[in-house]
């Protein structure tokens, strides 16, 4: 239904608090370097304007699109060119090209200092002084560092933050209460950020059809009792919502997401038996709960998939008549039977099925040709199962830090041209898959592992795209989204790489390492490990173990020394010499 004033419509639907939060997120994701105070001024101006449009939809400029209104606000910022360079060129364009231009300038790796969580006392003081400003800062800090973060979900995390601070700031030991709770929120939010980035990459590179296929598989796994038509409706809605958020239409995205939650709660009987608990919650929590819902029980009487898709004599006719519907039905039927598979795997199987029909339906005896298709799925299923088995075994043997190091060595050998910070970030994230997934029941491991790895590898691709340095990475990143993970897994040591020369300063450390938090210490060590592999890509596991063990002892010894600086200065060169010798 058309509205005279889109901005008035969204303000009324979302309410002032959520409206302001979403506008702040939008501005922070577009102009990532502006301070909070500058953005909040714009947010207040937009909010005041929206209120005038609510009062009178015919007021001046109220009929303008939200992109036009937001873009005009951003383009009016003084010194835009000084701070943002060529992004200012976007302002010479008309909508919708101007918004497209803004989107293209979003930076996945902005040059911002990592956000350091303040001490508990400081957080509580500032939160109690002004909760709105505190949470506004939270939205701003996260949104500018994650320009594709799913906006309505970020509002949910801000709400969680609010709950935690409200509860913990009255405790005597604020830090003991806050730290584990905020760590949990942060962990969930970081995973949400890479998952959403993957969705936007899918949308940007492969369009709505590819995303909708992903949504059909996911919904079918979650709601195996829903009819195909219901799954198609949900997938279409989810695709629209994600397209809006990825495209910067955050108000429409959040509004449509709330509408979808309402629809699902009104139609529980035809969707899933597991929704009721979610449907009793307020809007943000309801949507989040529905997005994380456990799988419904699979119907007991499902016939074999072969009946309709292999044994039926009309397979080629059905396929030819409506290819997308027939393939969608196949994906739905296969996915609802396999909550134990990753979405990536299900899409690979659907692709294999499609390729088989394309080939076989053009031949003389199609049924004989496609009759073995389900058996041909076996190697595609075994490959990720083996990946999960070997990696979880390695994780159980080495623990998270050791497993990260093993992954770091592996990926540095595959793509030694990639910058060390990017390799360390990717390996640390890939290495977390163990903690996240390997402790789950068997049936949940594969979807957890593969879909998480795919999202992390998408982040690697996005960063690599900015400054491409490795042909192998480019090749894996250019192909289909669902083939990425197998492509990276299949990479071996890059034989074309000319080893980096040994630079003593790369392995020179100072006493400042002693006071670093554990995480930062690990990153320092992992940086050294990646540099070692770049120097000696064919170093054996034992050689690397020896050098890294020696390095750990050296740091430990010097950090315990009375004169730390002197210890690092004298023992450091000895360590470098020993390392060179061990790797010779």
């Amino acid at each position: 239904e058309a509205h005279k004033s889109e901005i008035a419509h969204r303000f009324k639907d979302l309410g002032e608090q959520h409206f302001k939060g979403l506008v702040l997120i939008a501005f922070s994701q577009y102009l990532q370097k502006c301070p909070y105070e500058e953005h909040i001024k714009l947010v207040q101006e937009v909010t005041d304007f929206a209120k005038t449009c609510v009062a009178d939809e015919n007021a001046e400029n109220c009929d303008k699109s939200i992109h036009t209104l937001f873009g005009d606000k951003l383009c009016a910022i003084p010194k835009l060119r000084d701070n943002y360079g060529e992004l200012a060129d976007c302002c010479a364009k008309q909508e919708p090209e101007r918004n497209e231009c803004f989107l293209q300038h979003k930076d996945d790796n902005p040059n911002l200092p990592p956000f350091q969580r303040p001490e508990a006392e400081a957080m509580c003081t500032s939160f109690q002084e002004n909760p709105t400003s505190f949470l506004g800062h939270y939205l701003h800090e996260v949104a500018r560092r994650h320009p594709y973060f799913y906006a309505p979900e970020l509002l949910y995390y801000a709400e969680k933050y609010n709950e935690v601070l409200t509860q913990c700031c009255t405790e005597s030991d604020k830090a003991a209460c806050l730290t584990p709770k905020l760590d949990a929120v942060k962990e969930k939010a970081l995973v949400a950020a890479v998952r959403q980035r993957m969705k936007c990459s899918s949308m940007q590179r492969f369009g709505e059809r590819a995303f909708k296929a992903w949504a059909v598989a996911r919904m079918s796994q979650r709601f195996p009792n829903a009819e195909f038509a219901e799954i198609t409706k949900l997938a279409t809605d989810v695709t629209k919502i994600n397209k809006e958020c990825c495209h910067g239409d955050l108000l429409e995205c959040a509004d449509d997401r709330a509408e979808l939650a309402k629809y699902m709660c009104e139609n529980q009987a035809t969707i899933s038996s597991k929704l009721q608990a979610c449907c009793d919650k307020p809007v943000l929590q309801k949507s989040q709960c529905l997005a994380e819902i456990e799988h419904d029980n699979i119907p007991a009487d499902l016939p074999s998939i072969a009946a309709d898709f292999v044994e039926d004599k009309e397979v080629c006719k059905n396929y030819a008549e409506a290819k997308d519907v027939f393939l969608g039905t196949f994906l739905y039927e296969y996915s609802r039977r396999h909550p134990d598979y990753s979405v990536s795997l299900l899409l690979r199987l659907a692709k294999k099925y499609e390729a088989t029909l394309e080939k076989c339906c053009a031949e003389g005896d199609p049924p004989a040709c496609y009759g073995t298709v389900l058996a041909e799925f076996q190697p595609l299923v075994e490959e990720p199962k083996n990946l999960v088995k070997t990696n979880c075994e390695l994780y159980e043997k080495l623990g998270e830090y050791g497993f990260q190091n093993a992954v770091l060595v592996r990926y540095t050998q595959k793509a030694p041209q990639v910058s060390t910070p990017t390799l360390v970030e990717a390996a640390r994230n890939l290495g977390r898959v163990g903690t996240k997934c390997c402790t789950l029941p068997e049936a949940q491991r594969l979807p957890c592992v593969e879909d998480y790895l795919s999202a992390i590898l998408n982040r690697l691709c996005v960063l690599h795209e900015k400054t491409p340095v490795s042909e192998k990475v480019t090749k894996c990143c250019s192909g289909s989204l669902v083939e990425r993970r197998p492509c990276f897994s299949a990479l071996t040591v890059d034989e074309t790489y000319v080893p980096k020369e040994f630079k003593a300063e790369t392995f020179t450390f100072h006493s400042d390492i002693c006071t670093l938090p554990d995480k930062e210490k690990q990153i320092k060590k992992q940086t050294a490990l990646a540099e070692l592999v770049k120097h000696k890509p064919k170093a054996t596991e034992d050689q690397l173990k020896t050098v890294m063990g020696d390095f750990a002892q050296f740091v430990d010894k010097c950090c315990k020394a009375a004169d730390k600086d002197n210890c690092f200065a004298t023992e450091g060169p000895n360590l470098v010499a020993r390392s060179k010798e061990a790797l010779a």
Epitope: S126, E129, N130
Partner: nanobody, 118 residues
Framework: EVQLLESGGGLVQPGGSLRLSCAAS????????MSWVRQAPGKGLEWVST????????YYADSVKGRFTISRDNSKNTLYLQMNSLRAEDTAVYYC???????????WGQGTLVTVSS
């Protein structure tokens, strides 16, 4: 690493004004309560003023109340102290400090010298 860099000190006549600045870096500035502390020649440290994270609450020592104004600009990560009607007894090195808890400070600047003399 955390750095606090004061500036704006100098020689001023009694009754004159000065504005001190403190540029903060190496930490997220906005959630922290910040203070000014001074040390007159040969004397101990004296707390001057404190401001809450978003600037809605300010506190002053009786000796400067009505003459000094503390403020902050979180967008610039900067703390200020506007000093008016200066007196000879305001002569001191002025330090800005990051408050960690209940008027205890975990980081200080190097200080800026203010001399009030005719």
């Amino acid at each position: 690493e955390v750095q606090l860099l004061e500036s704006g000190g100098g020689l001023v006549q009694p009754g004159g004004s000065l504005r001190l600045s403190c540029a903060a870096s190496g930490f997220t500035f906005w959630p922290y309560t910040m203070s000014w502390v001074r040390q007159a020649p040969g004397k101990g440290l004296e707390w001057v003023s404190t401001i809450s994270p978003f600037g809605s609450t300010t506190y002053y020592a009786d000796s400067v109340k009505g003459r000094f104004t503390i403020s902050r600009d979180n967008s610039k990560n900067t703390l200020y102290l506007q000093m008016n009607s200066l007196r000879a007894e305001d002569t001191a090195v002025y330090y800005c400090a990051k408050v960690v808890k209940d008027n205890t400070f975990d980081y200080w600047g190097q200080g800026t010298l203010v001399t009030v003399s005719s």
